[in-house]
């Protein structure tokens, strides 16, 4: 059987993002997201 490995040689960077809710609406507090490889996933 062939064995497959994911080893592209590239490091995938992730970054925490935090936005104020009132910047996009009337709610208070913060919205927390995560950007992985340039894509916001949460």
């Amino acid at each position: 059987d062939a064995e497959f490995r994911h080893d592209s040689g590239y490091e995938v960077h992730h970054q925490k993002l935090v936005f104020f809710a009132e910047d996009v609406g009337s709610n208070k507090g913060a919205i927390i997201g995560l950007m992985v490889g340039g894509v916001v996933i949460a």
Epitope: K16, L17, V18, F19, F20, E22, D23, K28, G29, A30
Partner: nanobody, 124 residues
């Protein structure tokens, strides 16, 4: 354009308190989210706290929660950082920064304007 000038830093013993101020010039102060960052020797610049344009929302890094309080007075174009129960690891240059609405408040690169910084030294 916004110009920021910090003050209030100094030398304090562990367990003590300091209040930093950041005075902003310009009539657009209330349109910016404001934050404090800090830069300790040999470390990257670190987000500390941010406050929304209205002052109604705040956000803190875990290491200062319950000890530091960020506030702002839009009538005086000033943002404050009340620092209590200071620890030696809080020693750093503290910078005030301004970012337009809609940007990530913890990300250094999203801030358009920075002050020159004020030194905070906490001795043990």
């Amino acid at each position: 354009e916004v110009q920021l000038v910090e003050s209030g830093g100094g030398l304090v013993q562990a367990g003590g308190s300091l209040r930093l101020s950041c005075a902003a010039s310009g009539r657009t102060f209330s349109t910016y989210n404001m934050a404090w960052f800090r830069h300790a020797p040999g470390k990257e610049r670190e987000f500390v706290a941010a406050i929304s344009r209205s002052g109604g929302s705040t956000y803190y890094v875990d290491s200062v929660k319950g000890r530091f309080t960020i506030s702002r007075d839009n009538a005086k174009n000033t943002v404050y950082l009340q620092m209590n129960s200071l620890k030696p690891e809080d020693t750093a240059i503290y910078y005030c920064a301004a970012a337009p609405r809609g940007r990530s408040i913890v990300t250094t690169a999203t801030y358009d304007y920075w002050g020159q910084g004020t030194q905070v030294t906490v001795s043990s």
